[in-house]
Interface confidence: low
């Protein structure tokens, strides 16, 4: 018929699936898609920039042994041949083809056919609900091995949900009447028939139910709550939800600083046991008696110190080493003449001699000391 | 050369039941949907229903539901059986191919018909 | 079902005359619309798919348009085979429904 077709050409291109067939030599740079149109027609279109301006020849046959004939329905891009229709009217065929400029062949290739199929999209959509279940039936494609695939989703939704089956009945449960549900239908040939390089038919034009009747549209955002009412308690709700934790934060991060600058003070019965119980509190009767490892120096005024309610503290605490830290001689001169000191948190080396209000203490290497 | 060849023509009395053949060749693919049509003497083109001869799967149409049976020996003979015969089903029967092509479809192929009267 | 009204029923023209018939759907049905020429004693034709789309070996006098609702057959210069009864169908609905025919005879 010699009819240039413009139908599918301006499309062609936006189209994914090229493969890039070169064969070396001249095929090299061409690109090539085959899509076959629910195994009535055959589009072939080709992307050769070293001829994009020139009017490439298409010639085929779907029979090793038969002639080539040449493309009486060709596409057209910018003027200038990109692809041809054929009319292969359900054939598992091989088709040969060969793209020429003139008499030069620029692409020679074959292809069995099926393994391009697009199914048509479907027809005679029908939706037939009961209760919270909707089943979704169309005319099934007159070919097998096809999976007829459901894709619905409410306004409450992020993504679609999708159901397949291989005949177009589709039933889908747990459906809230009360929602508005958009759906929409498409076919795809099964993988492990066809292979991997068919295309998915085009959806079905979506259509919205809701109470089982069809709407014009669902509502962009879900109507109860109202949609600006719904984003502002999200965003109130991440709102208080990031005060609250930085809240809790600043609490952590105060007491961990209250604990450094204020250390706990233990119950000096559970510490030294036996100074209240046996030495009636008598700190230096105790250590003479328990450990015996220094001499201690009575300081003036140690008389006038209060009772076993507040005895200095020596905290000896299984702690892991860090980096060890001495006091430095200023430090412990403070120390003796009543000046208030705040030791670090860190162990002092094992063996070191520490004196403290007069008491002279040998320290491991698991101890701190702690006022 | 694609071709419908369908069985001859048949008289039937009221209540009976009948049924037409109709054999497809000249293409080798199952997967067609294969239609029956009947036109009254004189009458406009009615639809019956339509039988998927891949999947065996009818679709019928609501006037002749309960009435019609679309069967298939093989994937190339499909037959139509119309059951409790009234005079007005008096009419030529047609086997018809259906071409899906793209979104749309059509009828591209029809049988010769059969002639089926209904006379007591 | 979509109901498909052809209009005129009957029409009497002259060879070389342009002829059209008209095709209303109850309902749109896009353009999934056909056209179908039959001859006395014989099975219909499929002349136009698809609305306007011209079946393979159907000689160009013959053209279909529309969309929606409204559609037209026309035949730019009758010959004298085309005397003959024309059915449009719709495809669009499962249920396939026929206009009442418009038959084109000799004037």
């Known amino acids: 018929m010699g009819r240039l077709v413009l139908l599918w050409g301006a499309a062609v291109f936006l189209l994914g699936g090229w493969m890039a067939l070169g064969q070396g030599g001249a095929a090299e740079g061409v690109q090539i898609q085959i899509i076959y149109f629910n195994l009535e027609t055959v589009q072939v279109t080709w992307n050769a920039s070293k001829y994009s301006r020139t009017n490439l020849t298409f010639h085929y046959r779907f029979n090793g042994d038969e002639a080539y004939d040449q493309c009486t329905n060709y596409l057209l891009q910018e003027g200038h041949t990109s692809g041809c229709l054929l009319d292969a009217e359900q054939r598992d065929d091989i088709l040969y083809f060969s793209i020429r400029n003139g008499t030069h062949p620029v692409f020679t290739a074959s292809r069995w056919m099926v393994y391009y199929l697009k199914p048509s999209s479907p027809k005679h959509v029908r939706f037939s609900w009961h209760q919270d279940a909707v089943t979704v039936t169309c005319s099934d494609l007159s070919y097998g091995d096809l999976l007829y695939e459901v894709q619905y989703r409410s306004p409450f939704d992020t993504e679609w949900q999708s159901k397949q089956e291989n005949t177009c009945n589709v039933t889908i449960e747990g459906l809230d009447a009360e929602k508005c549900y958009s759906f929409w239908v498409r076919v795809k040939a099964m993988e492990d028939v066809y292979g991997p390089d068919t295309y998915p038919s085009d959806w079905s034009e979506v259509t919205c139910w809701q109470r089982g009747e069809i709407r014009d549209a669902c509502a962009e955002t879900p109507t109860p709550p109202k949609p600006k009412l719904s984003k502002f308690i999200l965003i109130s709700s991440l709102a208080i939800l990031l005060m609250v934790s930085l809240l809790l934060l600043s609490l952590w991060k105060l007491w961990r600083v209250k604990k450094f600058l204020i250390p706990s003070v233990p119950d000096p019965k559970s510490i030294f046991p036996g100074l209240f119980e046996i030495h009636q509190g008598n700190f230096q009767e105790w250590i003479t008696d328990t450990q015996n490892v220094a001499h201690l120096h009575k300081m003036a005024g140690a008389e006038q110190e209060s009772g076993p309610e507040e005895p200095l503290v020596v905290q000896l605490a299984k702690t892991e080493a860090e980096s060890p830290r001495m006091l430095d001689p200023q430090t412990e001169e403070k120390e003796a003449s009543g000046g208030s000191l705040q030791l670090p948190h860190q162990p002092l080396q094992g063996g070191d001699v520490v004196t403290i209000g007069g008491f002279t203490f040998v320290m491991n290497d698991r101890s701190y000391v702690a006022l | 050369q694609v071709q419908l060849v369908q069985s001859g023509a048949e008289v039937k009395k009221p209540g009976a039941s009948v049924k037409v053949s109709c054999k497809a060749s000249g293409y080798t693919f199952s997967g067609y949907y294969m239609h029956w049509v009947r036109q009254a003497p004189g009458q406009g083109l009615e639809w019956m229903g339509r039988f998927n001869l891949h999947g065996g799967v009818a679709d019928y149409a609501q006037k002749f539901q309960g009435r019609v049976t679309m069967t298939r020996t093989s994937i190339s003979t499909a037959y139509m059986e119309l059951s409790r015969l009234r005079s007005d089903d008096t009419a030529v029967y047609y086997c018809v191919r259906e071409r899906q092509w793209l979104v749309q479809d059509y009828f591209d192929y029809w049988g010769q018909g059969t002639l089926v009267t209904v006379s007591s | 079902d979509i109901q498909m009204t052809q209009s005129p029923s009957s029409l009497s023209a002259s060879v070389g005359d342009r002829v059209t018939i008209t095709c209303r759907a109850s309902?749109?049905?896009?353009?999934?619309l056909n056209w179908y020429q039959q001859k006395p004693g014989k099975a219909p034709q499929l002349l136009i798919y698809?609305?306007?789309s011209l079946q393979s070996g159907v000689p160009s006098r013959f053209s279909g348009s529309g969309s929606g609702t409204d559609f037209t057959l026309t035949i730019s210069s009758l010959e004298p085979e085309d005397f003959a009864t024309y059915h449009c169908q719709q495809s669009y609905s499962i249920s396939v429904t026929f206009g009442g025919g418009t038959k084109v005879d000799i004037k």
């Open positions: 698809a609305a306007s």
């Open positions: 309902q749109s049905i896009s353009r999934s």
